[in-house]
Amino acid sequence: FNISGCSTKKLLWTYSTRSEEEFVLFCDLPEPQKSHFCHRNRLSPKQVPEHLPFMGSNDLSDVQWYQQPSNGDPLEDIRKSYPHIIQDKCTLHFLTPGVNNSGSYICRPKMIKSPYDVACCVKMILEVKPQTNASCEYSASHKQDLLLGSTGSISCPSLSCQSDAQSPAVTWYKNGKLLSVERSNRIVVDEVYDYHQGTYVCDYTQSDTVSSWTVRAVVQVRTIVGDTKLKPDILDPVEDTLEVELGKPLTISCKARFGFERVFNPVIKWYIKDSDLEWEVSVPEAKSIKSTLKDEIIERNIILEKVTQRDLRRKFVCFVQNSIGNTTQSVQLKEKRG
């Protein structure tokens, strides 16, 4: 098809070799008169169009993406040739940065339903450059975590070294939808909820004497639980005595609940106390038996091949520890009567 009628947008992706960046292109279709596919509410020139832009389409994935080879060859279907580029609904997602991503990307509806739709396409000229200036060594990460229940902020990586005062107007999107009230280089979140998680895109315009282009960065935002303030608690054994049969094998299980910690180094071990002596026992490896966002339950067993008289005089102690502190639970064996 003839792409000369496509509306054109220029974008710049400046990536750092130190960060784990991705990139997205939205299929930003224009609004030719009478086109049902590219239909959206009429906007005044000052308004920014809202994404996702397919208000008239029943199926948001009803768009085709192409790359225009620089040598003038026919347009290539993105899905067939580029494994590091994936299409998610009407968004093109680049999983790895690199100058080889530079080029022209065209999107248009899959179904051409009227003559007006022929020109219903967008050509995005993407320039990809590695970051050269080392002036901003500590720019914001392209993956940012917010702690649930606390205040937080999401920074635009390409502008995070600039003060709010000198920052240009920024257009923010979350999961492809325009966040119309956000215009600064940082989104401040008063209280973090699960719904703040998502893929955020920050755009700003850069110009020179010849032309202007959109500088874009993508931020993956995750909402996570804050570190626990509690030491682990032992769920089992509950009782401090255990009835046993002499000469029989015995397994005592220690189950402990550890609260979430970003740097998680749980300790769970068994040791034996016999009068003034105590020593750690070599036991099977600990295993995680339940893992949730807030905590993890870990189990470690002590195995006695057969219970002896000597074992009845000993205390078997389960010791658990995290970065906050430790807890112990001791078990005394008692011979079963009758």
Partner: antibody
Framework: SLEESGGRLVTPGGSLTLTCTVS????????MAWVRQAPGKGLEYIGV?????SAYYASWAKGRFTISKTSTTVDLKITSPTTEDTATYFC?????????????WGPGTLVTVSL | DIVMTQTPASVEAAVGGTVTIKCQAS??????LAWYQQKPGQPPKLLIY???ILESGVPSRFKGSGSGTEFTLTISDLECADAATYYC??????????????FGGGTEVVVK
């Protein structure tokens, strides 16, 4: 391709450096990882060195291992190995850029820590 | 750190059958999950990345799904060659709060 070397029998407390030699791979374009596997056990992630030369480690591996690179090699230094460090050590190349899915692996080199 | 819990530890199924392996992350990792296959004496082989994208050359009998904290690998029309240990891996990477990469404990698939 990737090939690990330097695996040997070492006594606890000694120092050991493993080398991953790459061919046909531009190390400025890929994150490189070290992963180990104790005999009969699962895969254990140690850490990576990214395209810009920054190293990141699993929390248990911090201070015990150091990853560095040249234009054609990626090194893993094991400081004060213990018997628990006995394993096959693999180096792996990321899918591209600073990613953590690894689509090219070396055959591995065996490190045995024993008295 | 992130804890990846894989279940079951071992599963047996007949040729032509279907196997489902589950992987749970201790915190959300969106779609940053990979699946690997490892046969004895060999390094792991990447099967799926980004939770559901099939690596080039991997048969479509392998299917990855899930997002957030719960993920599944389904192998249908089992073949003898599928007998191996399968690992999930969190590939989230580095954020402002830490470094999140790690493997599940593995699932041994035995084909009868």
């Amino acid at each position: 391709s990737l090939e690990e070397s330097g695996g040997r029998l070492v006594t606890p407390g000694g120092s050991l450096t493993l080398t991953c030699t790459v061919s046909g791979i531009d190390l400025s374009s890929y994150t490189m990882a070290w992963v180990r596997q104790a005999p009969g056990k699962g895969l254990e992630y140690i850490g990576v060195i990214n395209t810009g030369g920054s190293a990141y480690y699993a929390s248990w591996a911090k201070g015990r291992f150091t990853i560095s690179k040249t234009s054609t090699t990626v090194d893993l230094k094991i400081t004060s190995p213990t018997t628990e460090d006995t394993a096959t050590y693999f180096c792996a190349r990321s899918y591209g850029g600073n990613r953590y899915d690894f689509n090219i692996w070396g055959p591995g080199t065996l490190v045995t820590v024993s008295l | 750190d992130i804890v990846m819990t894989q279940t079951p530890a071992s599963v047996e199924a007949a040729v032509g059958g279907t196997v489902t392996i589950k992987c749970q992350a201790s915190q959300t990792i969106t779609s940053y999950l990979a699946w690997y296959q490892q046969k004895p004496g060999q390094p792991p082989k990447l099967l799926i990345y980004r939770a559901s994208i099939l690596e080039s050359g991997v048969p479509s009998r392998f299917k990855g799904s899930g997002s957030g904290t719960e993920f599944t690998l389904t192998i249908s029309d089992l073949e003898c060659a599928d007998a191996a240990t399968y690992y999930c891996q969190c590939t989230y990477g580095t954020t402002n709060t830490g470094h999140y990469v790690g493997f599940g404990g593995g699932t041994e698939v035995v084909v009868k």
